[in-house]
Interface confidence: low
C-alpha cells in the first residue's frame, strides 16, 4: 500500500510538471483536482515550483468556484488548500487497497 | 504605458541568420509570457514562439523548430529571437507581444513590428 | 494541432450594421478563444479573450459568444473605425498557439 501512495505521488508530480507542456495531462490534472476538490500534490505551493507560462498563477480547477482565469493571482480564500496526493489516497485506501 | 519596440530586421541571404529584438517599457517585465507573431506580406497571422516569464517554458511553431531560439534577459526588458537557415518563406513582418498574466497564450500588447526579407 | 476556420472570409457592411464573425475550431477547445483585429499597416489589437471578456479599453459595442467548437464575435452597430482585419485564435491546446485566416470586413 505505501509503495503505491509513493508511486501516486511521485506520478502525480511528474504530471505536475508537464502541466503547461500537455494538454492531454492538463486535463487529467484538473478533472482530479476539481472532483477532489484539491490542488496540487502536498499542497497548492506545489505549483509555485512548476516554471509554466505564467507567475503567481494555480490551475483554474484548483479554485472553489471554477471560471477561467480564477487561478490569476488567486486569494488563497477562493482554492482548495488540501493536497491531492492524500486526499486521492485516502479515497484510494478506502475503495481500492 | 506599454510600449514594445521590435528591431533587427533586415534584407537577408537564404541561409543566413538574422537576431531580431524587442525593447520592453510600461510594465513589469518579468511577471510575463512574450511571444513573437510573424505576418507575411498580405498573408495572415503565424504565432512563431512564446517564452515564460521565468525562461522555464519555451515553444516553437513547427515551421520553425531547430531553427529559431527565443531568450529573454529580463534585467534589460529585452526578448530576442534568434533566427537561424532562414528561408524565403520566413519573409514578413515580426511582431512581439505580451501575454496576459493569467493567459500566457492571449497577448494583449504587440509592437508595430519588424520586416525580415529572405531574398537572395 | 488545432485548426481555426473562420468565416466569411470577407464581408461588406454598412456603418450601423449588426455584423457577426463566426470561428470554428476543429476540437473543443472550452471557452479558450480570442479575438483580435487589425487594421492596414497597425499591429493586431486585443479585442475578447476566454470567448467573451471584453478586454480593457474595447467599446461595448463588440461581444463575443460560444465554447466548445462554435464561437461568434458580434459587432452591434458598425461605426467607420470597425473596418478592419478580425482574426480569431486559440490559446487551449498549445504549444502551437494558432490563428484563424482572417475575415476581412469592407464598407458596402
Known amino acids: 500500500r505505501d509503495k503505491v501512495m509513493s508511486e501516486f505521488n511521485n506520478n502525480f508530480r511528474q504530471q505536475m510538471e508537464n502541466y503547461p507542456k500537455n494538454n492531454h495531462t492538463a486535463s487529467i490534472l484538473d478533472r482530479m483536482q476539481a472532483d477532489f476538490k484539491c490542488c496540487g500534490a502536498a499542497n497548492y505551493t506545489d505549483w509555485e515550483k512548476i516554471p509554466s507560462m505564467s507567475k503567481n498563477r494555480v490551475p483554474d480547477s484548483c479554485c472553489i468556484n471554477v471560471t477561467v482565469g480564477c487561478g490569476i493571482n488567486f486569494n488563497e480564500k477562493a482554492i482548495h488548500k488540501e493536497g491531492c496526493v492524500e486526499k486521492i489516497g485516502g479515497w484510494l485506501r478506502k475503495n481500492v487497497l | 504605458e506599454v510600449q514594445l519596440v521590435e528591431s533587427g530586421g533586415a534584407l537577408v541571404q537564404p541561409g543566413r541568420s538574422l537576431r531580431l529584438s524587442c525593447a520592453a517599457s510600461g510594465f513589469t517585465f518579468d511577471d510575463y509570457a512574450m511571444h513573437w507573431v510573424r505576418q507575411a506580406p498580405g498573408k495572415g497571422l503565424e504565432w512563431v514562439s512564446g517564452?515564460?516569464?521565468?525562461?522555464?517554458?519555451?515553444g516553437y511553431a513547427d515551421s520553425v523548430k531547430g531553427r529559431f531560439t527565443i531568450s529573454r534577459d529580463n534585467a534589460k526588458k529585452s526578448l530576442y529571437l534568434q533566427m537561424n537557415s532562414l528561408r524565403a518563406e520566413d519573409t514578413a513582418l515580426y511582431y512581439c507581444?505580451?501575454?496576459?498574466?493569467?493567459?500566457?497564450?492571449?497577448?494583449?500588447?504587440w509592437g508595430q513590428g519588424t520586416l525580415v526579407t529572405v531574398s537572395s | 494541432d488545432i485548426q481555426m476556420t473562420q468565416s466569411p472570409s470577407s464581408l461588406s457592411a454598412s456603418v450601423g450594421d449588426r455584423v457577426t464573425i463566426t470561428c470554428r475550431a476543429s476540437q473543443s477547445i472550452s471557452s479558450y478563444l480570442n479575438w483580435y483585429q487589425q487594421k492596414p499597416g497597425k499591429a493586431p489589437k486585443l479585442l475578447i479573450y476566454?470567448?467573451?471578456s471584453l478586454q480593457s479599453g474595447v467599446p461595448s459595442r463588440f461581444s463575443g459568444s460560444g465554447s466548445g467548437t462554435d464561437f461568434t464575435l458580434t459587432i452591434s452597430s458598425l461605426q467607420p473605425e470597425d473596418f478592419a482585419t478580425y482574426y480569431c485564435q486559440q490559446s487551449y491546446s498549445t504549444p502551437p498557439i494558432t490563428f484563424g485566416q482572417g475575415t476581412r470586413l469592407e464598407i458596402k
Open positions: 507581444g505580451k501575454g496576459l498574466l493569467h493567459q500566457w497564450e492571449v497577448l494583449d500588447y
Open positions: 517564452i515564460s516569464w521565468n525562461s522555464g517554458t519555451m
Open positions: 476566454a470567448a467573451s
